[in-house]
């Protein structure tokens, strides 16, 4: 054999973010020579599950009929062929929502913002949480994390945007999470519609003042300005 077996592809349907109680199917796709598929879950005894391949043998199905906290986590899969086991797949992170009650999302000073001005999205939780996530519907890279350091929990996180352009307009939600598992998220906040008025030919925001360079709405940089408002919170882009 010229080299190691190619790694399989791992994915989840209908997606990798699943509400509590809903069903999810994990698929592992290898090669036609596969005789067996194995799914491993990080921090669980291996193998987490084994399945025989479905015809024509190049993939296997791992079914979760009702999503609970136990299923949330990081998975990898392998397949066995007559010459041995494959390399592990890239990891799949299966996230469960509904672990905690929903936070409240608001915009300061207002969800109606003029292009070129600043707006801050504020995600608030009535109980202390250590991670807040802001997502934008239909964004290519929707997740922005603010995570507290040293286990110091917070009731809120601020997501500043400046300068605002037309690409920042849209529907946002936020989630919150406790430190004992980043794969367990709250129910989503009620949606917040951010409406940007002004020229449709807004200049793209310059990344020179960014605290962190990363993909924001529709791959436009979402520019956090200034320092993180709560000293215990650290900014993460994912």
């Amino acid at each position: 054999q010229a080299g190691p077996l190619p790694k399989p592809t791992l994915w989840a349907e209908p997606g990798s973010v699943i509400s509590w109680g809903n069903s999810v199917t994990i698929w592992c796709q290898g090669t036609l020579e596969a005789r067996e598929y194995r799914l491993d879950k990080e921090e669980s005894p291996a193998p987490w599950d084994r399945q025989n391949p479905l015809e024509p043998k190049n993939k296997a199905r791992f079914s979760i009929p009702s999503m609970t906290e136990d299923y949330a986590g990081r998975y990898r899969c392998y397949y066995r062929s007559p010459v041995g086991w494959s390399q592990p797949s890239d990891p799949l992170e299966l996230v469960m929502t509904g672990a905690y009650s929903k936070p409240t999302l608001s915009a300061l000073p207002s969800p109606l913002v003029t292009s070129g001005k600043s707006v801050t999205l504020l995600c608030q939780s009535r109980s202390p949480m250590d991670t807040f996530l802001l997502i934008k519907e239909r964004a290519a890279h929707p997740l922005l994390h603010l995570r507290s350091e040293h286990g110091a929990q917070q009731h809120q996180a601020e997501f500043p945007m400046s300068p605002v352009t037309s690409v920042h307009g849209g529907t946002y939600r936020c989630f919150s999470s406790h430190g004992f598992s980043h794969y367990l998220l709250s129910h989503p906040s009620d949606p917040l519609e951010l409406i940007v008025s002004g020229s449709l030919e807004d200049p793209r925001p310059s990344p020179t003042r960014s605290v962190s360079t990363a993909a924001g709405p529709e791959d436009q940089p979402l520019m956090p300005t200034g320092s993180v408002p709560h000293s215990g919170l650290r900014r993460h882009w994912e």
Epitope: W20, Y100, S101, Q124, S127, P128, H178, S186
Partner: antibody, heavy 120, light 110 residues
């Protein structure tokens, strides 16, 4: 009709235990709410006992004075919340309410209350 | 810990009077403050949430104001049905709290 109904109150001796129930109707306890237990001793003010998050993890927080004597739990299949009270003392005599925290973070729905009397 | 201090504890007033009750938080609670009315033998009733928003069905003579640490409940013209005890409450839930309610203000007939 959306309501909370407490039950399980009564007379109990000092040192005894009691379990109160709070049955929800018209909404699901597994929706995105917090539910709190609040008590009111005769002629006194409202006193927060603790709260449980309706999310699947069911996080609970208690007032500092509870010190492990009371436990809040829930049974989603019965849409019911519980308050287990142990090592009861005369000063625990009160009307006990369950109440729902709405989206506005206020207690927007209250039960009618159930009276617990601790006396020998 | 967040302590809620309500004043006065008792208030004597007449029908038609303008009544103001104050609630002070020991640290900022932003606008997460609610006011309740309670009558003897009854459960509390939500009057105002988020410091100034009137709950459904509450008469417009009730109003709330404030943010941060200082909040007030005002009854613009006291009616016979308003003689009751009023409580403030902050909206946070965590494990270092003694109580989430203020001590109460009893509004009685002068």
């Amino acid at each position: 009709e959306v309501q909370l109904v407490e039950s399980g109150g009564g007379l109990v001796q000092p040192g005894g235990s009691l379990r109160l129930s709070c049955a929800a109707s018209g909404f699901s306890l597994s929706s995105s709410y917090w539910i709190s237990w609040v008590r009111q001793a005769p002629g006194k003010g409202l006193e927060w006992i603790g709260s449980i998050d309706s999310g699947s993890v069911g996080i609970t927080y208690y007032a500092t004075w509870v010190k492990g004597r009371f436990t809040i739990s829930r049974d989603n299949s019965k849409n019911t919340l519980y308050l287990q009270m142990n090592s009861l003392r005369a000063e625990d005599t009160a009307v006990y309410y369950c109440a729902r925290h709405g989206d506005n973070w206020a207690l927007d729905l209250w039960g009618q209350g159930t009276l617990v009397t601790v006396s020998s | 810990d967040i302590q809620m201090t309500q004043s006065p504890s008792t208030l004597s007033a007449s029908v038609g009077d303008r009544v103001t009750i104050t609630c002070r938080a020991s640290q900022s609670i932003v606008s997460w403050l609610a006011w309740y009315q309670q009558k003897p033998g009854k459960a509390p009733k939500l009057l105002i949430y988020k410091a100034s928003t009137l709950a459904s069905g509450v008469p417009s003579r009730f109003s709330g104001s404030g943010s941060g640490t200082e909040f007030t409940l005002t009854i613009s013209s006291l009616q016979p049905d308003d003689f009751a005890t009023y409580y403030c409450q902050h909206g946070y839930i965590r494990g270092d709290l003694d109580n989430v309610f203020g001590g109460g203000t009893k509004v009685e007939i002068k």
